[in-house]
Interface confidence: low
């Protein structure tokens, strides 16, 4: 039927026009935001940061490697981003949180225990989809079993308790390169976000059979980018707005 075909084409065209319009508005909004950012930073043009520079600056961990490989940073294309977003669907965003210094952290041999994390206001307890703690374990010389413990520091109790367990796990490591290990910390993170005063930090331990700690907590020489960090995936369901 010629009429219905024509009608269908008009509808398709209408949808495409809406798509194009929507894409154009989105692009112009992004451009406007970029101009504002550049003016705040007193810059005329966007800095040209290569993938290699970013590789050096960011932790050398699997989730970040994947992100860098997935998106060519040099390609300034608004359709490629680490946010999947439009005004009608939930957006998910991955936030990488690096440890910071804290007054709360207990001192051991004059240096603070790792780690304390401060959270961006973007991270709200009911919006956390996933939270992984990533730790790097130094290479071993012989095949060995490693016992990993993640402890949450708490205010000392009457019986001397200063921490409570998040997770303990056993890993078999072979000689060669070190490994990145991730631990699910979603529940702990949600508790911290509900009660920020309970966030006194965590302690990371990864001992081999001889009692040597393999976890990189305070990177030494040649250990740049091997700090522990939190990978948090948050979701945001925006209110459906009329244009």
């Amino acid at each position: 039927n010629e009429n219905s075909e024509q009608k269908e084409n008009v509808e398709k065209e209408g949808l495409c026009n809406a798509c194009t319009w929507r894409q154009n508005t989105k692009s112009s909004r992004i451009e406007a935001i970029k101009i504002q950012i550049l003016s705040k930073l007193r810059l005329e043009t966007a800095p040209n940061i290569s993938k290699d520079v970013i590789r050096q600056l960011l932790p050398k961990a699997p989730p970040l490697r994947e992100l860098i490989d997935q998106y060519d940073v040099q390609r300034d294309d608004s359709s490629d981003g680490s946010l999947e977003d439009d005004d009608y669907h939930a957006t998910t965003e991955t936030i990488i949180t690096m440890p910071t210094e804290s007054d709360f952290l207990m001192q051991v041999d004059g240096k603070p225990k790792c780690c304390f994390f401060k959270f961006s206001s973007k991270i709200q307890y009911n919006k956390v989809v996933k939270a992984q703690l990533w730790i790097y374990l130094r290479p071993v010389e012989t095949p060995t079993t490693v016992f990993v413990q993640i402890l949450r520091l708490i205010k000392p109790m009457k019986d001397g308790t200063r921490y409570t367990g998040i997770r303990s796990l056993k890993l078999d490591m072979n000689p060669g390169t070190g490994i990145w290990q991730s631990i699910d910390v979603k529940t702990v993170l949600q508790n911290w976000l509900k009660q920020p005063e309970s966030n006194l930090g965590i302690e990371i331990k990864a001992l081999d059979e001889n009692g040597h700690d393999l976890a990189v907590t305070f990177p030494g020489p040649g250990e740049d980018g091997l700090n522990p960090f939190l990978e948090v995936k948050v979701t945001d369901t925006p209110k459906r707005s009329r244009r």
């Epitope: 367990g165 331990k205 009692g211 040597h212």
Partner: antibody
Framework: QVQLVQSGAEVKKPGASVKVSCKVS????????IHWVRQAPGKGLEWMGG????????IYAQKFQGRVTMTEDTSTDTAYMELSSLKSEDTAVYYC????????????WGQGTMVTVSS | DIQMTQSPSSVSASVGDRVTITCRAS??????LAWYQQKPGKAPKLLIY???DLLSGVPSRFSGSGSGTDFTLTISSLQPEDFANYYC????????FGGGTKVEIK
């Protein structure tokens, strides 16, 4: 193979103190944590406290705080547990046990030391 | 203080039976839980740590499960040498033991 060897049985009077030793052999003592657990006749296991052989830092169960002292001598790879103001209810077998680190299960145990408190 | 409650306090069983012992923590202890076997006049022996990891050399008929507050020790097919006392223990921070379970011959 790591072994923990404890001192022999003791008989004490109420109000006295007892010091039990636990010698570690076959391993790096300084990387261990030594805990003390006691068991009264026909009863269950009761954790008393622990000491880090590396730092000498201690943690005691609330019940024994002020009455128990745990120490170590790294030159002889020996840990000690001293319990003061003994009462008849302190009659028990006292065990030392090794943990690989602060929060670990006790994988190696001493043979136990019987302490009898009697007037 | 976190309390560890073990049940039952005793169980009568025959060789070949499947035996299940449970342990409940009064608060979340993640998987920082161990199971021990103790025979009369002997020191306890570690069987399972991290709630489900079998210590090397322990027969595979022993298994552990659970996380958080509820834990289980299972002996799939009881052997004559398994008649003993069993204790659970939380070992995070200040350790503490459950009251024990005596596995005796029916």
């Amino acid at each position: 193979q790591v072994q923990l060897v404890q001192s022999g049985a003791e008989v004490k009077k109420p109000g006295a103190s007892v010091k039990v030793s636990c010698k570690v052999s076959g391993g790096t003592f300084s990387t261990f944590h030594i805990h003390w657990v006691r068991q009264a006749p026909g009863k269950g296991l009761e954790w008393m406290g622990g000491i880090s052989a590396y730092s000498g830092s201690t943690i005691y169960a609330q019940k024994f705080q002020g009455r128990v002292t745990m120490t170590e001598d790294t030159s002889t790879d020996t840990a000690y547990m001293e319990l003061s103001s003994l009462k008849s209810e302190d009659t028990a077998v006292y065990y030392c046990a090794r943990a690989r680190y602060v929060d670990d299960a006790f994988d190696i145990w001493g043979q136990g030391t019987m302490v009898t408190v009697s007037s | 203080d976190i309390q560890m409650t073990q049940s039952p306090s005793s169980v009568s069983a025959s060789v070949g039976d499947r035996v299940t012992i449970t342990c409940r923590a009064s608060e979340d202890i993640s998987n920082f839980l161990a199971w021990y076997q103790q025979k009369p006049g002997k020191a306890p022996k570690l069987l399972i740590y991290a709630a489900s990891d079998l210590l090397s050399g322990v027969p595979s008929r022993f298994s552990g499960s659970g996380s958080g507050t509820d834990f289980t020790l299972t002996i799939s097919s009881l052997q004559p040498e398994d008649f003993a006392n069993y204790y659970c223990q939380k070992y995070i921070s200040a350790p503490s033991f459950g009251g024990g379970t005596k596995v005796e011959i029916k």
